[in-house]
Amino acid sequence: GPVWRKHYITYRINNYTPDMNREDVDYAIRKAFQVWSNVTPLKFSKINTGMADILVVFARGAHGDFHAFDGKGGILAHAFGPGSGIGGDAHFDEDEFWTTHSGGTNLFLTAVHEIGHSLGLGHSSDPKAVMFPTYKYVDINTFRLSADDIRGIQSLYGDPKENQRLPNPDNSEPALCDPNLSFDAVTTVGNKIFFFKDRFFWLKVSERPKTSVNLISSLWPTLPSGIEAAYEIEARNQVFLFKDDKYWLISNLRPEPNYPKSIHSFGFPNFVKKIDAAVFNPRFYRTYFFVDNQYWRYDERRQMMDPGYPKLITKNFQGIGPKIDAVFYSKNKYYYFFQGSNQFEYDFLLQRITKTLKSNSWFGC
C-alpha cells in the first residue's frame, strides 16, 4: 500500500467538535501524532492555514466522500491512506460524543488508530493492537502501542534512529561555516539571496556581510521544510519553490492561494518526481530545471517546455554535473552551481566555470 515518501508531515485541524475545548482537541491530536513519531523517523507539525498533508475533520452524515457517517455508535471515524488530496485525511463522526476520558468516545485513542491509517497501516488481527478494528477504552496515561503496531509502522518507515542518518536533525540549526555545508536550494529574491537547508533559510543581502537564519515556517507558515529547488522571475516579483512533485508560487513575498500545484503542469513527463534545482535566465526568458543528470528548458512566455529536452547537464554545462543541488543567477552573466559543499561560478556567455568556491563562501566564512 501507499506510504508518505517524506519524513516531515503536516496536519491541520479543519474544524473543532463542540464536545471538547479546542485546547483539548489540539492536545489529543498532537499526542496521537506523537505516539507514531516516537517510534518512527516521522515528524509532524500542525499548520493553521493552507493545504496540509493530513486534514482532520469533524463531520456528520454525508460529508464529501463516499463514506457517509451513520449517526451515534457504529462507525466512529475513518481515514484515507497516504496520498494527495483526500489522501491521509482523518474524519471523525460528529454524532459521537468526543471526550478526553473514558466516557463517550476518547478522541486521543480514536485518533491514534485513524492516524495509523493516515500513515498507511491497515487493521491488525491482534486484539491488543491499537490498529485492531474495534474501539476499546484503555487508560490513556499508560497507553502504549503494541509490538504488532510498532512492527507494522516500522516496516513502512523504519525506526527513529534513522533520524540520526540525516546530516541535520529537524531541531538543530546547521552550522553556517561548516566547510561541509551544502544547500537544498538557492535563489535570488530582489537584492537578497535565499539559501534553503532543511527547515531553515539564510538571507544574504547583496554586498552586506551580515546574514540571518530563519525558519521557513516563520516567513511562510503554509510551506513545508526541505525546499528542493527555487527560482525567481524578478520582473514579475515571483518566486517558485519546489518540493517533491509540488510547487508553490510566492508573489511579492506572499504565498499565492491555490498552491501547491503539480510540477507536471510545466510539462514534465510522469517519471519526474522531483526537481533538484532550477534557475531563470531573464536574458532568454527561460527557466532551466535540473533533474538528476539531465535538464529541461522552459519558455516562461509561452508557458511550455522547449523542444529537444531533456539534455545531459555534463554535455551543455562544461565542468558541471552530473547532478547538482542548487543554482542561482547573478550579475547578468553568471550561474552559481552548488554541488555538495562546493560551488562553481559559471559564465553562461563564455560557457565555462570561472571560479570554484565553497558553498558557504557568501557568508564570509
Partner: antibody, heavy 122, light 103 residues
Framework: EVQLLESGGGLVQPGGSLRLSCAAS????????LHWVRQAPGKGLEWVSG????????MYADSVKGRFTISRDNSKNTLYLQMNSLRAEDTAVYYC???????????????WGRGTLVTVSS | DIQMTQSPSSLSASVGDRVTITCRAS??????LNWYQQKPGKAPKLLIY???SLQSGVPSRFSGSGSGTDFTLTISSLQPEDFATYYC?????FGQGTKLEIK
C-alpha cells in the same frame, strides 16, 4: 501505461440482462478502487457503482440498487457490472474509472476507459 | 444527500478569454471537489482534484479554488482545444456540466 477497456455493451430489451467487463492493465489492479460511471445520450455524468480493492466493499447509486451488481476478479485484472431488470432509462455509455489506493474510496477518477454503449429498447 | 449545482450550464467565449465556472455544494465538502473536462465522443479527463491541485500533464492555465461549499474552475487564457464540457464532482455526485462553446 494505465489502460481500461470496457466491453459487453449492446442492445437489450427492457427487463433483460447484460454483463459489462472492464479489462485493466498498466497498474497493480488489486490495489485500487474501481467504479462504473454512465452517461445517457446528450446528458451529464452519473456515478453508478464502486468496489474496493479486495472486492469486500461495494457501493451503488439509488437508481440501480437491487438491480446491478459490481464485482471484480483480481486474478484476471477485470471489473464487472451485472445489470438485471434493465429499463429504458439505463440506456447510456458506461465507463469504468480508476480511483485511489486504500481502504476508502476518494471518488477521484484519474483514469477512464473509452466506454461501452448499452441500449435498452424494445 | 449532498447536491452539486454547477453554473452556468453553457458559456460562449473566445480564444484568449479568461473563463470561470462555479460549483456549489449544498453543504460543506471541505476541499473534496474534482473537475473534469469532456470532449464529444470521448471519456472525461481529470483536470483538478482536491479543489485546487492540478492533475499531472494538465496545462497551468487551468486552476481551481474554493473550499466548503463554493468552488471555481478558471481557465486563464482559453485555447482552441479547451472548448468542451466541464463537470465538477464530489464522491458519487456530478454537477450538471458546463458546455463551453466558441463565441
Amino acid at each position: 501505461e494505465v489502460q481500461l477497456l470496457e466491453s459487453g455493451g449492446g442492445l437489450v430489451q427492457p427487463g433483460g440482462s447484460l454483463r459489462l467487463s472492464c479489462a485493466a492493465s498498466g497498474f497493480t489492479f488489486s490495489d485500487y478502487w474501481l467504479h462504473w460511471v454512465r452517461q445517457a445520450p446528450g446528458k451529464g455524468l452519473e456515478w453508478v457503482s464502486g468496489i474496493s480493492p479486495s472486492g469486500g466493499m461495494t457501493m451503488y447509486a439509488d437508481s440501480v440498487k437491487g438491480r446491478f451488481t459490481i464485482s471484480r476478479d483480481n486474478s484476471k485484472n477485470t471489473l464487472y457490472l451485472q445489470m438485471n431488470s434493465l429499463r429504458a432509462e439505463d440506456t447510456a455509455v458506461y465507463y469504468c474509472a480508476r480511483d485511489i489506493v486504500g481502504p476508502y474510496s476518494a471518488g477521484l477518477f484519474d483514469y477512464w476507459g473509452r466506454g461501452t454503449l448499452v441500449t435498452v429498447s424494445s | 444527500d449532498i447536491q452539486m449545482t454547477q453554473s452556468p450550464s453553457s458559456l460562449s467565449a473566445s480564444v484568449g478569454d479568461r473563463v470561470t465556472i462555479t460549483c456549489r455544494a449544498s453543504q460543506s465538502i471541505y476541499t473534496y471537489l474534482n473537475w473534469y473536462q469532456q470532449k464529444p465522443g470521448k471519456a472525461p479527463k481529470l483536470l483538478i482534484y482536491a479543489a485546487s491541485s492540478l492533475q499531472s500533464g494538465v496545462p497551468s492555465r487551468f486552476s481551481g479554488s474554493g473550499s466548503g461549499t463554493d468552488f471555481t474552475l478558471t481557465i486563464s487564457s482559453l485555447q482552441p482545444e479547451d472548448f468542451a464540457t466541464y463537470y465538477c464532482q464530489q464522491a458519487g455526485i456530478f454537477g450538471q456540466g458546463t458546455k463551453l462553446e466558441i463565441k
